[in-house]
């Protein structure tokens, strides 16, 4: 999908008031410096195309992120917000449901997310130059 | 304007099934996920599951799992939630209820169908 | 599963009185995730406040709300007949989402 159509504004809005707090959140407990972040974004739409894959596709060691609290408001917000994106995603989640398993907080999610914040807060700076 | 229609009430019979729907209108229906609310006679609000029309993804609270099937026809903009084997207990008001970001960004249920009474009766 | 505990149950207040509700939240929660309904006898609930303290659409500014944590609490601050309703109070911070049982407001 291609996130360059986004409303941008409203996203980020609604990343501030809600999905910011869910993050916090589901990494309560975990110091802020514990991980090191890895995954980068130059732009808004490029922000949006990692967030949606760290998010939503599943990976080794964490296949349950897409059912947490933040990544349903992220999916609403995605939804709402970037023209098209709902009809895009009935292949992404048929794959998402035959690679969920129980919901457990593994340190490889928490790894994940923290990665997210970080996109996030990158996503809100736009710009700012990379590092 | 948005708008939530649901289906009319009903009286079935113990050990059957019911499908009550919930037409939705003014508002992009693949979009925003919509939620299932039930309501006993005089009793509080209690959720159900909800189900995000555009890919069919759905979340249950763990009380109506088994009970419950959330579907959705986006080419008639509906969704609609299936009750099986029915009981006494299943007798209520059941809200189809849409969620989504308010004017301030906060995540709620801003607009409601009127509510489906199902009676379950021998 | 969050539980939330709405006191008092049932009240009765007098035009013109302050009301205040209260609702307990078993584990601390974002106040943007702490929402108020209204619901009125044989009709469906109304989003009444939002994230603890922003008032929908259409609210009377005798309305307030306010909270953090596990404490938050709907105030009218000058009762008036049309303010009569059930009020509860919905958490979106974790499944599955849950309400309060609700509070029964009475005109006295």
């Known amino acids: 999908y291609d996130f360059t159509n986004c409303d941008f504004e409203k996203i980020k809005a609604a990343y501030l008031s809600t999905i910011s707090k869910d993050l916090i959140t589901y990494m309560s407990g975990t110091k802020s410096t514990e991980f090191n972040n890895t995954v980068s974004c130059s732009n808004r739409p490029h922000c949006l195309t990692e967030i949606q894959s760290l998010t939503f596709n599943p990976t080794a060691g964490c296949a349950s992120l897409a059912k947490e609290m933040f990544a349903m408001k992220t999916k609403a917000a995605l939804a709402i917000w970037c023209p098209g994106y709902s009809e895009t995603q009935i292949n992404a989640t048929q794959a998402m449901k035959k690679a969920r398993k129980s919901k457990v907080t593994t340190n490889k999610c928490l790894e994940q997310v923290s990665q997210l914040q970080g996109l996030w807060r990158r996503f809100n700076r736009p710009l700012l130059k990379q590092q | 304007q948005v708008q939530l229609q649901q289906s009319g009430a009903e009286l079935v019979r113990p050990g059957s099934s019911v499908k009550i729907s919930c037409k939705s209108s003014g508002y992009a229906f693949s979009s925003y996920w919509m939620n299932w609310v039930k309501q006993r006679p005089g009793q509080g609000l209690e959720w159900i599951g909800q189900?995000?029309?555009?890919?069919?993804?759905?979340t249950y609270n763990g009380n109506f799992k088994g009970k419950t099937t959330l579907t959705a026809d986006k080419s008639s903009n509906t969704a609609y939630m299936q009750l099986s084997s029915l009981t006494s207990e299943d007798s209520a008001v059941y809200f189809c209820a849409r969620s989504g970001f308010d004017y301030g960004y906060f995540y709620a249920m801003d607009y409601w169908g009127q509510g489906t009474s199902v009676t379950v009766s021998s | 599963e969050i539980v939330l505990t709405q006191s008092p149950t049932l009240m009765a207040a007098s035009p013109g009185e302050k009301v205040t509700i209260t609702c307990s939240v078993s584990?601390?929660?974002?106040?943007?995730?702490l929402h108020w309904y209204q619901q009125k006898s044989e009709t469906s609930p109304k989003p009444w406040i939002f994230?603890?303290?922003n008032l929908a659409s259409g609210v009377p500014v005798r309305f307030s709300g306010s909270g953090s944590g596990t404490s938050y609490s709907l105030t009218i601050s000058n009762m008036e007949a049309e303010d009569a309703a059930t009020y509860y109070c919905q958490q979106w911070s974790s499944y599955p989402l849950t309400f309060g049982a609700g509070t029964k407001l009475e005109l006295k």
């Open positions: 994230g603890t303290s």
């Open positions: 189900i995000f029309p555009g890919d069919g993804d759905t």
């Open positions: 584990s601390s929660i974002s106040s943007s995730n």
